[in-house]
Interface confidence: low
């Protein structure tokens, strides 16, 4: 920033102005058949429905047009268990303040008017998001945008949730089968600048982004102001519960974020020094021992999100939760006078729900999560017994070609498979996406192996050997050759919001191995 020096870092905050109404966002192109069908109520599927097989022309790499049915309760439970296991979650989160089902606009408007009268200040109406989830949505969008730009086809993009915090007047009803964009008013922005520290180089930035496999936001647990001593009477206290961090996750960066409104009146030309302290030790009859973590200098007229680096203390809290006695914030004027944070425009827990203070932490796995395997084999045996007795039931997502009388199997390729979180009944805790195109590989790896089969040299040799000795050497297998990650944004049991990257969740390409 030429000629501005350090102070310029406090000048501009991103979303102070992003609170007036935005017009309806543009609609995304329609979902692929699979996603559209899944959005219409199917849990897992690839296109049409049992009565209606839609078959777009198959591309060399993927195919559509598959038969499927709704899963039974038991199967659904099994599916939920399996997916929770893949997501590394011991059980289905039941957040206190989760997301509620979106309602028809008229009913929603009527309910919102009633709720506005009943809700305590700072509590959003059901289905609306607080500051932390909204900020996390921006991160999620950033990641999704990156994924889009990295060449994922439309069918492989994650479909987002339709029910974010836009008012009903802002909504435009999409045609059936179209994905809803995340339509909400965004107030969120991290502060500009990085606390005076030299900004990370772009190489470090890229490495950091690639490394961070989980981002978690935490809500302030302090409900009532404590009586501090006269010297610290204007201090504000914040507490965040970091005890639920999955094992093996290490904090790479952590920030405390607080919103600052524009200050008018007697302080309108004032400059404030805002300091964040770690509480080291609490005492009964004297001030707590504090350790200064980060500071900001702000003008009264500034408006927007301020961020403070609390990486060091967060790591300590994760390793030794008993040391987590929270944070304290103090505000001092240019003349050295301690003032109440509200006088400096800082928004506390009694402020609007989308301006509540929160904490965000970036994590990196230090040890690989190993899925606990359950007895899949016994289940498979059970399924095959069921399949023989209930032949009318399509017990798996079956290719239309399976039903050809000629029994000719198509060549190895990617097939569409859409997993709908909505139909798993998870819309109250998974914020985004609504589901994702997992896809799968199926088909023959027969001689001669074509170029589009992405065959390895070994697979080619195996095919030749299979031709000569079919009873001893099997054909190569059709398996994923390219896998993509997905990002999932969800609430945990404590209503904290987590953004997690899951690698190898989407099949991008298949080949013979």
């Amino acid at each position: 920033m030429p000629g501005l020096g350090r102070r310029a870092q406090w000048l501009c905050w991103w979303w102070g102005l992003l609170c007036s109404c935005c017009g309806p966002p543009p609609l995304r192109p329609p979902l692929p058949a699979a996603a559209a069908a899944a959005a219409g109520g199917q849990l897992l599927g690839d296109g049409g429905s049992p009565g209606r097989t839609e078959q777009p022309p198959p591309s060399p790499q993927s195919s559509s047009g598959f038969l499927y049915r709704r899963l039974k309760t038991q199967e659904k439970r099994e599916m939920q268990k399996e997916i929770l296991s893949v997501l590394g979650l011991p059980h289905r989160p039941r957040p206190l303040h989760g997301l509620q089902q979106p309602q028809p606009p008229a009913l929603r408007q009527q309910e919102e008017q009633q709720q506005q009268q009943q809700l305590p200040r700072g509590e959003p109406p059901p289905g609306r998001l607080k500051s932390a989830p909204l900020f996390m949505l921006d991160l999620y969008n950033a990641l999704s945008a990156d994924n889009d730009e990295d060449g994922a086809s439309e069918g492989e993009r994650q479909q987002s949730w339709p029910h974010e915090a836009a008012s009903s007047s802002q909504r435009r009803q999409p045609p059936p089968g179209a994905a809803h964009p995340l339509n909400r008013k965004s107030l969120l922005a991290p502060g500009s600048g990085s606390g005076g520290a030299s900004p990370l180089t772009s190489a470090q930035d890229s490495a950091f982004l690639n490394d961070a496999d989980m981002v978690m936001s935490f809500v302030n647990l302090v409900e009532y102001d404590k009586e501090f001593s006269p010297r610290q009477r204007h201090h504000k206290e914040f507490k965040f519960n970091l005890s639920q961090i999955p094992e093996g996750e290490v904090v790479t960066a952590a920030e405390f974020r607080i919103y600052k409104d524009c200050v008018m009146g007697s302080f309108k030309n004032q400059t404030f020094l805002i300091s964040i302290y770690q509480v080291l030790q609490e005492h009964q009859h004297r001030d707590s021992d504090l350790f200064l973590l980060d500071t900001r200098v702000v003008w009264a007229s500034e408006e927007g999100w301020l961020e403070f680096d609390i990486t060091a203390t967060s790591n300590l809290w994760v390793v030794t939760p008993q040391h987590n006695m929270g944070l304290q914030l103090s505000v001092v004027t240019r003349d050295g006078v301690h003032v109440h944070p509200r006088a400096a425009g800082l928004v506390g827990r009694d402020g609007p729900y989308d301006k509540q203070p929160f904490m965000v932490a970036f994590f990196k796995v230090s040890e690989v999560h190993v899925r606990t395997t359950r007895s899949a084999s016994s289940r498979r045996r059970q399924q095959s017994r069921n399949r023989s007795t209930q032949s009318q039931d399509v017990a798996r997502v079956s290719s239309a070609s399976d039903y050809n009388s000629s029994e000719l199997k198509t060549a190895c390729r990617k097939h569409e498979l859409y997993v709908s979180f909505q139909d798993l009944g998870w819309q109250d805790w998974i914020i985004a996406p609504k589901g994702y195109a997992a896809n799968y590989c199926d088909g023959e790896c027969s001689f001669p192996l074509n170029a589009h089969m992405n065959a390895t040299n070994h697979a080619i040799v195996q095919t030749l050997v299979h031709l000569m000795n079919p009873e001893y050497v099997p054909k190569p297998c059709c398996a994923p050759t390219k896998l993509n990650a997905i990002s999932v944004l969800y609430f945990d049991d404590n209503s904290n919001v987590i953004l997690k990257k899951y690698r190898n969740m989407v099949v991008r390409a298949c080949g013979c191995h």
Epitope: C22, D138, P181, P190, S202, D205, F362
Partner: nanobody, 116 residues
Framework: EVQLVESGGGLVQAGGSLKLSCAAS????????MGWYRQTPGKERELVAA???????NYADFVKGRFTISRDKVNNTVYLEMNTLKPEDTAVYYC??????????WGQGTRVTVSS
């Protein structure tokens, strides 16, 4: 290192138009917001317009209805179309891109002078 390069500034008559553009030397990972700021001598830098990755836009009151912010996702470029320019719009205009993980990228600025 990533560089943001602004262009399109210059001298224009009051009531005229200009289109500023800001291109990144390479794609920045994890961008979730882009915006234009301006600064006049002796005054602090102020937000003019911003756009998020989900294409939400907003404008400072003093440019509403006259300026339009847009972005080209493919080329990682953000634009500011300025119509009905006034002498008080004279300033150095800076582009900023905010990336996930405590990083803001700023351009060097482009000067816009509106003569009466």
């Amino acid at each position: 290192e990533v560089q943001l390069v602004e262009s399109g500034g210059g001298l224009v008559q009051a009531g005229g138009s200009l289109k500023l553009s800001c291109a990144a030397s390479r794609r920045i990972s994890g961008i979730y917001a882009m915006g234009w700021y301006r600064q006049t001598p002796g005054k602090e830098r102020e937000l003019v317009a911003a756009i998020t990755t989900s294409d939400h836009t907003n404008y400072a009151d003093f440019v509403k209805g006259r300026f339009t912010i847009s972005r080209d996702k493919v080329n990682n470029t953000v634009y500011l179309e300025m119509n009905t320019l006034k002498p008080e719009d004279t300033a150095v205009y800076y582009c900023k891109q905010s990336a996930w993980g405590r990083n803001d990228y700023w351009g060097q600025g482009t000067r816009v002078t509106v003569s009466s």
